[in-house]
């Protein structure tokens, strides 16, 4: 019995279906086919879970969180024992193993391994201003998304004709910050932060209005 090489890893957007491949060759009839799919979740590597089981001509549910979402892609028994997972969740990320036994065919590689990564587009980030908006001050524009896998990068732009940040601005696209030194009236305006990763983008808006000093009455 020989389980074929798997593609190594699969990426899928949260909520979308995933197919985890596992095929094998065997010299014996499929009368005593036994297939166990297991997962070692990324979130809890010490706690492997059963995903689905085929034994004695019957299918059995695995861990409760997979109930109603998992099945074999084809009619069993078969040499293609790939499974689907519907409505993928972040917690489905992990290393999946198919363990195949088909007595009396023993020997060879009977395990296939596939990694599953569930990707999440960035949630709309939160935009905020840190520091005084008085003319001449330094301000930091902050942008961060609560969700996003892979981790989002952040691009700030000023929504004027150029989309360029003021010349005194420095941007950190990993942290999502823009530091604007010595703000002036020209720093005023609407800024947009774009959070993006491999599968999506989202945005937030921030209105920076630099406060000019009020003229003082002398008298």
């Amino acid at each position: 019995l020989e389980v074929s090489e798997s593609p190594g890893s699969i990426q899928v957007a949260r909520g979308q279906p995933a197919v985890l491949p596992c095929t094998f060759t065997t010299s014996a009839a499929l009368i005593n086919l036994n297939v166990i799919w297991m997962v070692t979740p990324l979130s809890n590597a010490n706690q492997p879970e059963q995903v689905i089981l085929y034994q004695g001509g019957q299918m059995f549910d695995g861990a409760p969180r997979f109930h109603g979402r998992v099945g074999f892609t084809g009619t069993m028994p078969a040499t293609n024992v790939s499974i689907f997972i519907n409505n993928t969740q972040l917690s489905d990320t992990g290393t999946y193993q198919c363990l195949v036994n088909n007595l009396p065919d023993i020997g060879g590689r009977n395990i296939g391994v596939t990694g599953l990564t569930v990707l999440v587009p960035p949630s709309a980030p939160h935009c905020q201003i840190q520091g005084s908006q008085d003319i001449g001050s330094d301000v930091i524009l902050l942008c961060s998304s609560e969700e996003g896998i892979p981790r989002p990068t952040y691009l700030w732009e000023k929504l004027d004709n150029t989309l360029k940040l003021p010349p005194t601005a420095t941007q950190d696209q990993v942290q999502g910050t823009v530091t604007i030194r010595n703000i002036s009236a020209l720093s005023s305006g609407l800024y947009q932060c774009v959070a993006s990763n491999a599968i999506g983008t989202s945005t937030c808006l921030l209105d920076l209005q630099v406060i000019s000093p009020q003229p003082r009455n002398i008298g």
Partner: antibody, heavy 121, light 107 residues
């Protein structure tokens, strides 16, 4: 009481110009960003343009960029929309709207009653 | 641009009914969502801001919920003055965009 009263609508030929005005009262006009939103007959709402409280920053929808100019006169508590090179698809009721203060840029908390602009030959 | 899709486009209901209107954004907009009511020949009126906050002076039978991409406006017990068109609007990104509207009619 917040009030927004606009004027200047009417019938204009394609390619023509029109200037809408919106007189504001009941709040500190210069402290609020203002906006224009339009609604074609029987259709939904479309944001057109916005301007910061000081008048130093202006924003436009792609559909009007280069043709419309938003401005304000804080001494007169008045918002303007200069519309040039008008097209049939600009036919709509035009509303001026106040934007909520602070971090809520883009929330329209008070609206005018609207003025109809008809572009037709 | 962020697309806003409302459903249904129209509905018929009776006074006292519970009415639910949904709004879906083409990308996550967190809670940067507003709801407006517009009666024929009148200006829109802000009902709900920040997805779930009731604007001052708006009756408590109106409520909003949701975050991310899916949002709901609920009228707990429809009153005669509630027959109107309702619009959602996002302020997460530029340009600001509205849903196409949901017309609530008398059954």
């Amino acid at each position: 009481e917040v009030q927004l009263l606009e004027s200047g609508g009417g019938l204009v030929q394609p390619g023509g110009s029109l200037r809408l005005s919106c007189a504001a009262s009941g709040f500190t006009f210069s402290s609020y960003a203002m906006s224009w939103v339009r609604q074609a007959p029987g259709k939904g709402l479309e944001w057109v343009s916005a301007i910061s409280g000081s008048g130093g920053s202006t924003y436009y929808a792609d559909s009007v960029k280069g043709r419309f100019t938003i401005s304000r006169d804080n001494s007169k508590n008045t918002l303007y929309l200069q519309m040039n090179s008008l097209r049939a698809e600009d036919t709509a009721a035009y509303y001026c709207a106040r934007m909520a203060a602070g971090a809520s840029w883009g929330t329209f908390d008070y609206w005018s009653q609207g003025t109809l602009v008809t572009v037709s030959s | 641009d962020i697309q806003m899709t409302q459903s249904p486009s129209s509905l018929s209901a009776s006074v006292g009914d519970r009415v639910t209107i949904t709004c879906r954004a083409s990308q996550s907009i967190s809670s940067y969502l507003n709801w407006y009511q517009q009666k024929p020949g009148k200006a829109p009126k802000l009902l709900i801001y920040a997805a779930s906050s009731l604007q001052s002076g708006v009756p408590s039978r109106f409520s909003g919920s949701g975050s991310g991409t899916d949002f709901t406006l609920t009228i707990s017990s429809l009153q005669p003055e509630d027959f109107a068109t309702y619009y959602c609007q996002q302020r997460s990104g530029s340009p600001l965009t509205f849903g196409q509207g949901t017309k609530v009619e008398i059954k």
